[in-house]
């Protein structure tokens, strides 16, 4: 039975052609009687809100690998599972790519709209990793290391909508600790819970951690962005992250409110504004070309927000590669 | 970035003709392309795609009457047994990303089919 | 099989009204809905994609909007040059799919 799902290929994570992880390669799902009861239970697995559609597999570019293999002939959930794993499954005997299933959840936005209230992991790079700090009575905790799991990790990677939780031996640095009052500790999640605060825990603010404790969770973040080239890490040539590759972004529609929601998401104050000239003397980067015109309202916390054409899809050369500079 | 379509006539019934969608500026591994028609005075008729991959997908009404295939510039549609029906104003269009296959936001400018005896 | 049934076919309104199209389809496409304009003798031109997305170029008079089986593009403040006809288009599958667009709107300004 598959020990991951995504979905791959859509306008946002919540969205595309089915794929599940089996023994370390990811396969595709055929959709023979794949239908929304399949979808509720996949999109709920992701955190990706409720159910909206079945669309076709193949809808999706680009298309699954020719190498790649059809996992599973069927799924048949009741629409009640926690993950597509508890459904009932036929092995493959007779499918192709052209009946890959795909899915689509009614909330596209969860890998980037507000968080959760009642969960948040502060000062990392972006809302997917971070300081865990739970709210409790409109206070907000921070959680001890003691009792931690990689399965508390995964119900607060679920509950952000962050996919799966990435195992890191990363400790919270010195300027990361919580100035929290009161915090928590003795997680004992089974990793199937909804929210964290469905797990069990010791009680409130009794315990003997210190900050030193404050638990760090990175999750698998569906989007991650730098800066290359420069002298520190608030200038040089944009780069995203994507399918763990970095590629660089096209300068196709780009201007100042673009810099400015990179600059933000960076947490390196404002746009500089630069030139034309300024921006070229980053150089061409290499690899791929991730983004092309990107549109942004200003208003965004992070680039993914922001508007763009399909991953991948580009009439650019790496002469057009985006250099971005902000105040620091 | 454009796509010309050509191979339009006036052909008789029953008499095979093949479409040819030629592309420049863009790489046909990348994007989908679709066939639409168009019969005089009529709406916007789907014929088929062809995506990225090769995998090809056809109307209900066309399978068996129409064949799609693709070089690395071109997207062939083949009318296997034109009827009068068939007359209408051939276009090719892209595929404008994924998730958004049918949605074309490029197109040629169409090519026109008449078949009468 | 997916039907999309477009109402009115045909619709007239005078410069500086607001036009308003309906795309139903006979079965949920999550919002993989298109719209495009066509004029006569010209090839379609996409306006919408995604249900509610407008394409680059496009005046912010076009509006989409919808989700499930209903769908509609709203024209507001119509102007001379959106006289033309106007076709959604599904994107949500290709089985069993007898046309993937709608019928088709004429719109005419007064």
């Known amino acids: 039975s598959p020990s991951g799902v995504r979905l791959v290929g859509g306008l946002h994570r919540c969205e595309g052609r089915v794929e599940v992880e089996q023994k370390g390669q990811w396969g595709t799902v055929c959709d023979d009687g794949w239908d929304i009861k399949d979808v509720a239970v996949l999109c709920r697995e992701l955190g990706c809100g409720a159910a909206s559609g079945t669309p076709s597999g193949i809808l999706y570019e680009p298309p699954a690998e020719k190498e790649q293999k059809v996992l599973i002939q069927s799924v048949s959930c009741t629409g009640t599972e926690d993950t597509l794993a508890q459904c009932e499954q036929e092995e493959v005997y007779d499918c192709s790519h052209d009946e890959d299933a795909g899915a689509s959840c009614e909330n596209p936005e969860s890998s980037f709209s507000p968080v959760p209230e009642g969960v948040r992991l502060a000062d990392g790079p972006g809302h997917c990793k971070g300081r865990v700090e739970v709210k409790h009575q409109n206070q907000w905790y921070t959680v001890c290391q003691t009792g931690w799991s990689l399965r508390a990790a995964k119900v607060v990677c679920r509950q952000l909508g962050c996919g799966r939780a990435v195992l890191t031996q990363k400790r919270c640095n010195k300027h990361a600790y919580g100035r929290k009052p009161i915090w928590l500790s003795q997680m004992s999640c089974s990793g199937r819970e909804a929210t964290l605060q469905d797990c069990p825990s010791g009680p409130w603010g009794k315990n003997t951690c210190n900050h030193d404790e404050d638990t760090w969770v990175e999750c698998e973040d569906p989007f991650d962005l730098r800066l290359v080239g420069g002298d520190n890490l608030c200038s040089g040539r944009l780069e995203v992250l994507h399918k763990g590759v970095w590629g660089s972004v096209c300068d196709d529609n780009w201007g100042e409110k673009e810099d400015q929601v990179v600059c933000k998401q960076l947490g390196c104050g404002k746009s500089l504004s630069p030139s034309f000239r300024d921006r070229k003397c980053y150089g061409p980067g290499v690899g791929r070309i991730w983004l092309d015109n990107v549109r942004c309202s200003g208003e965004e916390q992070s680039l993914e927000q922001c508007q763009h054409r399909f991953w991948g899809f580009h009439d650019c050369t790496h002469q057009e590669d985006v250099a971005v500079i902000c105040s620091g | 970035q454009s796509l010309e379509e050509s191979g339009g006539r006036l052909v008789t019934p029953g008499t095979p003709l093949t479409l040819t969608c030629t592309v420049s500026?863009?790489?046909?591994?990348?994007?989908?392309m679709s066939w639409v028609r168009q019969a005089p005075g009529k709406g916007l008729e789907w014929i088929g795609i062809?995506?990225?991959?090769?995998s090809i997908f056809y109307a209900t009404w066309a399978n068996g009457r129409f064949t799609i295939s693709k070089t690395s510039t071109t997207v062939d549609l083949k009318i296997t047994s034109p009827t009068t029906e068939d007359t209408a104003t051939y276009f090719c269009?892209?595929?404008?990303?994924?998730?958004?296959?049918?949605?074309?936001?490029?197109w040629g400018q169409g090519t026109l089919v008449t078949v009468s005896s | 099989e997916l039907v999309l049934t477009q109402t009115p076919a045909s619709v007239s309104e005078p410069v500086g009204g607001t036009v308003t199209i309906k795309c139903q389809a006979s079965?949920?496409?999550?919002?993989?809905l298109s719209w495009y304009q066509q004029k006569p003798g010209q090839r379609p031109k996409l306006l919408i994609y995604?249900?509610?997305t407008l394409e680059s170029g496009v005046p912010s008079r076009f509006k989409g909007s919808g989700s499930g089986t209903e769908y509609t593009l709203t024209i507001s403040g119509v102007q001379c040059a959106d006289a033309a006809t106007y076709y959604c288009?599904?994107?949500?599958?290709?089985?069993?799919?007898?046309?993937?667009f709608g019928g088709g709107t004429e719109v005419v300004v007064k």
């Open positions: 062809i995506t990225s991959g090769g």
């Open positions: 500026g863009f790489s046909l591994s990348s994007y989908p």
């Open positions: 995604r249900a509610s």
């Open positions: 079965e949920s496409i999550s919002t993989y």
């Open positions: 288009q599904q994107g949500y599958t290709y089985k069993n799919v007898d046309n993937a």
């Open positions: 269009a892209r595929g404008y990303s994924s998730g958004t296959m049918m949605s074309s936001n490029l």
